[in-house]
């Protein structure tokens, strides 16, 4: 009864529910993450838990500093949901759920390039696939290392398509698109296409 | 009455090891954190780490790795083990209480224990 | 590991004079910061917890104040047996964050 009383006698301002956060909120399989349980307040020694479901994973101790908690999700039942209790001797408060979403990460992206010819002008269409990773894909078009088209999002396996045309060139130009999805700092390149510059007949990207 | 008093020092040659006690009556283990604290001859207090109630253990960085801090409830006793002694870590040892906000409560020490490090 | 600077080191006082001693945390330690004063050969005695909290049998010319980073002792009017050394200290402590005590503040007769 008097732990019943202790646990009333703590207003909710003084022993609010604690906040479950991480700085990645987008994770792929195999990545270590960090998951960060804290309280408003500072001046009590609080027993932090984390749980998923049901499961306990680790008990840390702390005041005036927030649990760390290291994970690796490396299945994808481990998303979630992630809850933290905050326990002060008899009272005990538990957080909002916290999940996290599996993204797998892209592949390197395959560049095709085709060429209409004309005597004055070069229509490019540059294509760009990557055949692995979670929708949606950002791809972007790259000329001689700068952007050249905005992010195009594509929500099916389907190549992104640019077109340009351009003044027969006298100099080489290379083309390459990244592909870039959810999982932030993740990006992977094609490989370089070189377009040669328009001297004789070369040009192994045109439509006869 | 509260009180906490440690045991265990005494002299200790380099390289050695050394375990301190700090025996807690009046104060539930399970309830409070209970951290260690030195003072060489002259100087000023060095805090060495602490352990929470549920167990878990945070240390100075410099004395990470050398030293240990674990507690038994049953015995409402909490440890320093000690180990790879040097000169530098001559001092007197104290164990302390937790300050806690709830109940509104301050810190209570234990008279400390002399660990002299020579050979 | 958080960094208390405390100043100043020494000073010199008269009995009935009002003493001022600061700390400073490298790192916000909310309001968990206690004072102590020391005398040569004796532990710590506490005097104020909780950047503001004055322990039990403590008189109460002496008083603690600050939050964050910046926290002070005043001892109101000096009496004889106030002359010792002074410490702060954060408690805070976790996964991220450990405590620390200040270098001290030695008081002597002017």
């Known amino acids: 009864r008097k732990a019943v009383l202790d646990c009333e006698a703590m207003k909710t301002n003084e022993f609010p529910s604690p906040c479950l956060d991480s700085k990645t909120k987008v994770v792929m399989k195999g990545q270590n993450v960090s998951m960060f349980c804290s309280h408003k307040n500072k001046s009590l020694q609080i027993t932090y838990s984390l749980f998923r479901r049901k499961t306990h994973l680790g008990t840390q101790d702390g005041k005036g500093e927030p649990a760390i908690f290291n994970l690796s999700i490396t299945e994808a039942h481990e998303s979630g949901p992630y809850k933290c209790k905050a326990q002060v001797t008899s009272c005990s408060k538990y957080s909002r759920d916290f999940s996290f979403t599996i993204v797998d990460p892209v592949t390197s992206p395959v560049l095709n390039i085709m060429v209409i010819q004309t005597e004055t002008d070069r229509h490019i269409t540059l294509h760009c696939l990557s055949v692995n990773g979670s929708l949606p894909i950002n791809y972007t078009f790259f000329e001689n290392h700068v952007a050249i088209s905005p992010a195009i999002s594509k929500y099916d396996r389907e190549p992104a398509e640019f077109n340009l045309t351009k003044k027969n060139p006298g100099e080489e130009e290379e083309y390459r698109c990244e592909a870039k999805n959810r999982l932030p700092n993740y990006a992977t390149y094609s490989h370089p296409v070189t377009m040669p510059s328009t001297g004789g007949d070369s040009c192994p990207f045109c439509l006869k | 009455e509260s009180q906490l008093v440690e045991s265990g020092g005494g002299l200790v040659q380099p390289g050695g090891s050394l375990r301190l006690s700090c025996a807690v009556s009046g104060i539930d283990l399970s309830s409070y954190a209970v951290g260690w604290v030195r003072q060489a001859p002259g100087k000023g207090l060095e805090w060495i780490g602490i352990?929470?109630?549920?167990?878990?253990?945070y240390y100075a960085s410099w004395a990470k790795g050398r030293f240990t801090i674990s507690k038994d409830n049953s015995k409402n006793t909490v440890y320093l083990q000690m180990n790879s002694l040097r000169a530098e870590d001559t001092a007197v040892y104290y164990c302390a209480r937790d300050v806690d906000s709830r109940p509104p409560t301050g810190s209570l020490w234990g008279q400390g224990t002399l660990v002299t490090v020579s050979s | 590991d958080v960094q208390m600077t405390q100043s100043p080191s020494s000073l010199s006082a008269s009995v009935g004079d009002r003493v001022t001693i600061t700390c400073q945390a490298s790192q916000n330690t909310y309001s968990n910061l206690d004072w102590y004063q020391q005398k040569p050969g004796k532990a710590p005695k506490l005097l104020i917890y909780q950047a503001s909290k004055l322990a039990s049998g403590v008189p109460s010319r002496f008083s603690g104040s600050g939050s964050g980073t910046d926290f002070t002792l005043t001892i109101s009017s000096l009496q004889p047996e106030d002359f010792a050394t002074y410490y702060c200290q954060s408690t805070s402590w976790g996964s991220s964050y450990v405590g620390g005590f200040g270098t001290g503040t030695k008081v002597t007769v002017l």
């Open positions: 352990i929470g109630r549920s167990g878990s253990i």
